[in-house]
Amino acid sequence: SGPLPKPSLQALPSSLVPLEKPVTLRCQGPPGVDLYRLEKLSSSRYQDQAVLFIPAMKRSLAGRYRCSYQNGSLWSLPSDQLELVATGVFAKPSLSAQPGPAVSSGGDVTLQCQTRYGFDQFALYKEGDPAPYKNPERWYRASFPIITVTAAHSGTYRCYSFSSRDPYLWSAPSDPLELVVT
């Protein structure tokens, strides 16, 4: 009959967790599951419960997680991996808009994330997008051109910097930048 369908794994309230702040990992399978297994990859950490409450985020808890469940003698496929990121590990970068934070509809603007440190990766996200509990998109450069701006691009932006050597240890978020489309 094949393996059972994979469960979902989410971090509440977010998979971006400031150091010392709490987060809950929740594995969700179908009703009547006999046993859950939630594990941190590349470690020996695991538990046989669906919910993991982390009362205070630490560097050592950042990383990739997944879960599965058992019904009878059958195990499910593993969930999609969840990347749990510790933020506030490094000083915040600065975020600016070129030529400026006010741009006409149809114009171009570039958001630049800058840091004093030698980080090689940056993450930019817009408040409310992407959906809650989902990692912001990662970009491997410090410039984020937005071509042919529309009203949908207006909003509050923040960026993070981090190193590819420790991809789950991020800086504090930059101060917010309000992009205004006129």
């Epitope: 950490r45 695991y46 993991l52 050592s60």
Partner: nanobody, 125 residues
């Protein structure tokens, strides 16, 4: 704020006894395994004893078996390490640690997320 605070260390003569306490604040210890670890000057940190949350099962390093006893009082959110028949080689800084993943015994010290600041135990005549 999640904190572990050790107390009870001090200077004691060989053959003496001490009782170390590890008090938790900011979260409840009920669900977590607790480990006691120690680090002597110039040496690596080593596991001394661990206790599970589920059934109270315990682990002891060979060097302390029969002399040390670990226990927990969930009502007081505290774990204890009773150390009897102390020897000079027990001299070290003693740390307690816990981790949100562990309800069963796990004495791999490098994988504990939460650590206390440590309490000094010196055994000397």
């Amino acid at each position: 704020q999640v904190q572990l605070q050790e107390s009870g260390g001090g200077l004691v003569q060989p053959g003496g006894a001490l009782r170390l306490s590890c008090a938790a604040s900011g979260f409840t210890l009920d669900y977590y395994a607790i480990g006691w670890f120690r680090q002597a000057p110039g040496k690596e940190r080593e596991a001394v004893s661990c206790i599970s949350s589920s059934d109270g099962s315990t682990y002891y390093a060979d060097s302390v078996k029969g002399r040390f006893t670990i226990s927990r009082d969930n009502a007081k959110n505290t774990v204890y390490l009773q150390m009897n028949s102390l020897k000079p080689e027990d001299t070290a800084v003693y740390y307690c640690a816990t981790d949100p993943f562990y309800s069963d015994i796990n004495c791999k010290s490098y994988e504990y997320a939460y650590w206390g600041q440590g309490t000094q135990v010196t055994v000397s005549s």
